[in-house]
Interface confidence: low
């Protein structure tokens, strides 16, 4: 059987290294060897490249080496496949070396900001040594912020033959680290070089970008003053590296700027003590280059009626996220503030907040919250400068069984009845929403009985017990993950009711 006709011939000129062609099929059923016939020097010369018989393998590739690599030039290539049964020739293919030239990558040696020019980086590189001296090179510059996986690209050409080249990359973010890599190719070529080694540069710092500002209103004190915990953070979209030297706060009662108070701090939180009126609060951050735009917050008067527009809220878990969704009766509200913090018996150690715009849902990655911890999540509607009534819910990203069972005691022991009372498990030990309690009780040497009650019940009267009998009992608290038993208690039913005993004696 004759070998298959070589097809899909593809050639590439590795500048000053070799001229290599490949074809298909790569494998033949019987042993096949190949000859690649080339004409070069614009058709004036020809030669042959043979695949190596000694390896006894089918090589669907062959390379022509210097000094017969001529450039510029047009080559023709024809591949002959030969086996014991005969020869099969490919079609003749035509190759312009300028169009298939591949060169080495350039080498970036500098990525710097230029003093006084904002949001720009100047990239300097060395043209590849192995590149035609006089040809125009086209370039692709790839860049991304250091913590992003998404590359952006810009394409340009350079005609100069200096080996040091420069490109100014503009419209970047201020004070941000960028990663750069560069590739090049002769202008007419279809083959790009590999990418250069990555280099990192940082744009110049500017005055801070802006702040997100929020507050926690605390109950008024005995003297009538209201503690207000202010908190702020870099606005979403601020440069990653942005650092503030400090923050200026000023505040005053509405319509009375004469009573303006000012505070300077390096913290990102500050407690104010305000009167009962409406107040306006302003915060700016500053660095050596200037101030950020002002962040403004209105603190409502103590007796102000706040609007309510959230009708319902649900928290649900996906595989790796907690999603909170809410329904609102006010279509005009499109900004919401979400607060979340662990529901612990002590003061919460970590309080977090985030603004949501043009959505009625909020998501957080599960691994940003601690499993087995209950989180309080509140959503506040924000309409211009007014903050509405929050709607709150609780959620666990993962429930476990309680770390301890309920502490239980037996009261009002009778002949056939007993009242069992148990304490709620402390928040820190619940590890999930307690959905029910199960009372397990058993007479000595008797069958075990159980009774399950709702989680809001902390007392239960057992009836139809046997008189003058020892019982053991424990209460199990259950979450969705399972239950944990409290300590076992023992009691003995009476032989005769106290009531009956006294009555008898009286007669």
């Amino acid at each position: 059987v004759l070998p298959a006709k070589p097809e899909n011939i593809s050639c590439i000129f590795y500048y000053e290294e070799n001229f290599t062609c490949t074809w298909s099929p790569e494998k033949e059923a019987s042993y096949t060897w190949y000859k690649v016939k080339r004409t070069y020097s614009y058709g004036y010369k020809s030669d042959i490249c043979s695949t190596d018989n000694s390896t006894r393998g089918n090589h669907a590739s062959c390379s022509f080496l210097p000094p017969t690599i001529t450039n510029p030039d047009n080559y023709t290539i024809q591949v002959e496949a030969q086996n014991a049964d005969g020869i099969m020739k490919s079609d003749i293919t035509y190759w312009n070396l300028d169009a298939i030239m591949k060169i080495e990558p350039p080498e970036i040696f500098s990525v710097k900001s230029v003093l006084g020019i904002k949001r720009m980086l100047q990239i300097k590189w060395i043209r590849p040594v192995l590149a035609p001296h006089s040809s125009t090179l086209k370039y692709t510059l790839r860049f991304r912020t250091i913590n992003s996986a998404y590359w952006m690209e810009v394409n340009f050409t350079k005609e100069d033959i200096d080996r040091d080249e420069t490109y100014n990359l503009t419209e970047l973010q201020a004070f941000t680290e960028y990663v750069m890599t560069l590739r090049c190719a002769p202008a007419e070529s279809m083959f790009w070089s590999g990418w250069s080694q990555e280099k990192v540069g940082t744009t110049e710092e500017e005055a801070p970008y802006g702040l997100d500002l929020w507050r926690v209103l605390k109950p008024a004190m005995v003297d009538g003053r209201r503690p207000v915990q202010l908190m702020w953070k870099k606005a979403t979209g601020a440069p990653v590296l942005e650092k503030a030297l400090g923050y200026n706060i000023w505040y005053f009662p509405e319509n009375n700027t004469n009573l303006t108070e000012t505070v300077n701090t390096t913290n990102q939180t500050h407690e104010l003590y305000l009167g009962g009126k409406t107040y306006w609060v302003y915060v700016v951050s500053y660095n050596s280059l200037g101030e950020s735009p002002v962040a403004t917050l209105r603190i409502p008067a103590l007796n102000e009626k706040t609007f309510q527009c959230i009708e319902a809220m649900q928290a649900c878990l996906t595989q790796d996220q907690l999603v909170v969704e809410w329904q609102s009766s006010a279509p005009e509200v499109d900004t919401w503030m979400v607060e979340w913090f662990p529901d612990v018996d002590s003061e919460p150690s970590s309080f977090s907040w985030e603004s949501v715009s043009q959505a009625r849902n909020w998501t957080i990655q599960k691994d940003e919250l601690k499993p087995l911890w209950c989180y309080n999540i509140s959503v506040y509607p924000v309409l211009r400068d007014r903050v509405g009534q929050p709607y709150s819910t609780q959620a666990y990203v993962q429930e476990g069984i309680p770390s301890a069972g309920p502490v239980t005691q037996a009261d009002s022991i009778g002949v056939k009845t007993v009242t069992i009372t148990w304490k709620e498990i402390p928040k820190s030990k619940r590890n999930g929403f307690i959905k029910n309690y199960t009372i397990f009780y058993q007479a000595e040497d008797g069958k075990e009985f159980s009774k399950t009650v709702n989680s809001n019940i902390l007392q239960y009267r057992l009836e139809s017990l046997t008189r003058r009998t020892s019982y053991s009992l424990q209460v199990m608290a259950s979450t969705n993950a399972g239950g944990t038993n409290g300590t076992k208690i023992n009691f003995k039913t009476l032989s005769i009711s106290h009531h009956h005993h006294h009555h008898h004696h009286h007669h």
Partner: antibody, heavy 119, light 107 residues
Framework: EVQLVQSGAEVVKPGASVKVSCTAS????????IHWVRQRPGAGLDWIGR????????KYAPKFQGRATLTADTSTNTAYMQLSSLRAGDIAVYYC????????????WGTGTLVTVSS | DIVMTQTPLSLSVSPGETASISCKAS??????VTWFRQKPGQSPKLLIY???NRYTGVPDRFSGSGSGTDFTLRISTVEADDTGVYYC?????????FGQGTKLEIK
Amino acid sequence: EVQLVQSGAEVVKPGASVKVSCTASGFNIKNTFIHWVRQRPGAGLDWIGRIDPANGNTKYAPKFQGRATLTADTSTNTAYMQLSSLRAGDIAVYYCARYYYVSSYFDVWGTGTLVTVSS
Amino acid sequence: DIVMTQTPLSLSVSPGETASISCKASQSVTNDVTWFRQKPGQSPKLLIYSASNRYTGVPDRFSGSGSGTDFTLRISTVEADDTGVYYCQQDYSSPWTFGQGTKLEIK
């Protein structure tokens, strides 16, 4: 990339203390527990204790109670283990490990720090 | 403390065979058992968690089973790269404890 990089090897005198650091990258230690485990030469693994960096709460194995002190600095995303009154039996590689609660496992281990006690 | 006892302490298996390592807890640890492998000079690497769940990227030749007090790690079609010391560990109750380790050699 999520990783825990520990401080370099230490040679200390008997009776002295050593403090090993464990710096996290790719995640916030406030959202996990950091545990410490030691491995004596040619021997198995021994749990020392754990810290919750969000609030500083610690739990120790009884045999290390009083000698080991676990701390964390969330601003630098670093956990520390200090072991005092060192003796020859404390020669070991000390590892920190991240405990992934959602599925209950140590999914990331530190690079290990060799502590040698020698006069 | 809960004691985790591994058997055997060393094991020599030919490539392609199955290796089994047993781990016994001194009291019930439900399914709170994790298996690790440690190669010389390296940190332990997670293989199996919650007794039977394979960690991301671990080949399905590795499987874990058991609950209560008896647990087993099985490596089917053993390969040369499977050498190392295998540890079980319980995180059911503090202090968390490890088995003594089983050294797996490939013949």
